[in-house]
């Protein structure tokens, strides 16, 4: 799967390769199967959406988002406390302004709960990842894609 | 065996190519980011170039901006450094590093043994 | 970018003398400070994360300590092995990761 997403500027290089993995899933133990890539946009530093394909998994999986900031006054992990979903399956994180530290570093971690070994963690440049835009339709989000919050996430979890 | 190890290197003309090569084994490699450093003749470490997990985020040095490539193949457990318009001053060891999240905390738990580029005309 | 200055350089001691080597940021790093030993056509092998945790498997005797700017490696009985070249890399402003210039430890 190869999605192109806005190109914005700076040195870092930002198609959406998500790597899917052609091993079979019973050769490998949970714990090593690769995870999808989170893709993070700042759109007008209003919000941020930190998104990634949930249908790369072998089986649906609620997959958590946390992150940090490298920073003296606030390096506590944070979970996510909206998720996005894409058919009932977590697709992704948003933030919001509050949220949002352009020149800090921004940790992104991602983790099976089912298998906490099961994570991976990369950090980012924010600045590097600002889209300007007017208007978005439902369309350019990529169909049904909802806001939940990590309340909803726990009773839809367990539901 | 948990390891990593370079090959690729060699003598190369100033202007040349060379594309490294960076072998993983015994972690998952897919869900690690690996780094690129280097160490000059009887210099200091130097880091050249990061590459995030699944690939699509990378980050490059100033002094190789522009003339490293920095890719990885996590189907074969491979990271590769292609390496263009070489100069004198890339002479160095150059040593993959794989990194490591404790807490909020990220170091180079794993590195390779190196393998050795030289520039010279 | 950041920059990373040890202190000494160079330093000669003895088996068994307590031995500390500095580093210093051009800014303030919080506790993301790791150390690394480099044996001459080695490679590096990480000694300390987050400026005062012992890497699993290493010696008791290897600590580390500061946050903000300034920061300590101390060896508190110098064994025959632990001579080597030391660095200490900040991983804050990250990347770029920078490294101290190193501090060659040599036996007196």
């Known amino acids: 799967l190869n999605t192109t997403i806005l190109t914005p500027n700076g040195n870092e290089d930002t198609t959406a390769d998500f790597f899917l993995t052609t091993m079979p899933t019973d050769s490998l133990s949970v714990s090593t199967l690769p995870l999808p890539e989170v893709q993070c946009f700042v759109f007008n530093v209003e919000y941020m959406n930190c998104t990634w394909n949930s249908s790369s998994e072998p089986q649906p999986t609620n997959l958590t988002l946390h992150y940090w900031y490298k920073n003296s006054d606030n390096d506590k992990v944070q979970k996510c406390s909206h998720y996005l979903f894409s058919e009932e399956i977590t697709s992704g994180c948003q933030l919001q302004k509050k949220e949002i530290h352009l020149y800090q570093t921004f940790v992104v971690q991602l983790q099976d709960p089912r298998e906490p070994r099961r994570q991976a963690t990369q950090m980012l440049k924010l600045q590097n990842l600002v889209i300007e835009q007017k208007l978005i339709s439902e369309e350019d989000l990529g169909g049904e894609q909802k806001l939940i919050s990590e309340e909803d996430l726990h009773h839809h979890h367990h539901h | 065996q948990v390891q990593l190890v370079e090959s690729g290197g060699g003598v190369v003309k100033p202007g040349g190519s060379l594309r490294l090569s960076c072998a993983a084994s015994?972690?998952?490699?897919?869900?690690?980011?690996i780094h690129w450093v280097r160490q000059a003749p009887g210099k200091g470490l130097e880091w050249v170039a990061l590459i995030s997990y699944a690939g699509s985020n990378k980050y490059y040095a100033d002094s190789v901006k522009g003339r490293f490539t920095i890719s990885r193949d996590n189907s074969k457990n491979t990271l590769s450094l292609q390496m263009n318009s070489l100069r004198a001053e890339d002479t160095a060891v150059y040593y993959c590093?794989?990194?490591?999240?404790?807490?909020?905390?990220?170091?180079?738990?794993?590195w390779g043994r190196g393998t050795m580029v030289t520039v010279s005309s | 970018d950041i920059q990373m200055t040890q202190s000494p350089s160079s330093l000669s001691a003895s088996v068994g003398d307590r031995v500390t080597i500095t580093c210093r940021a051009s800014?303030?790093?919080?506790?993301?400070l790791n150390w690394y030993q480099q044996k001459p056509g080695k490679a590096p092998k990480l000694l300390i994360y987050?400026?005062?945790s012992l890497q699993s498997g290493v010696p008791s005797r290897f600590s580390g300590s500061g946050s903000g700017t300034d920061f300590t490696l101390t060896i508190s009985s110098l064994q025959p092995e632990d001579f080597a070249t030391y660095y200490c890399?900040?991983?804050?402003?990250?990347?770029?990761?920078?490294f101290g210039q190193g501090t060659r430890l040599e036996i007196k």
């Open positions: 015994g972690f998952t490699f897919s869900n690690s980011g």
């Open positions: 890399q900040q991983s804050y402003s990250t990347p770029p990761i920078t």
């Open positions: 987050a400026a005062s």
């Open positions: 800014q303030s790093i919080s506790s993301y």
């Open positions: 590093a794989k990194e490591v999240w404790t807490g909020t905390y990220d170091s180079f738990d794993m």
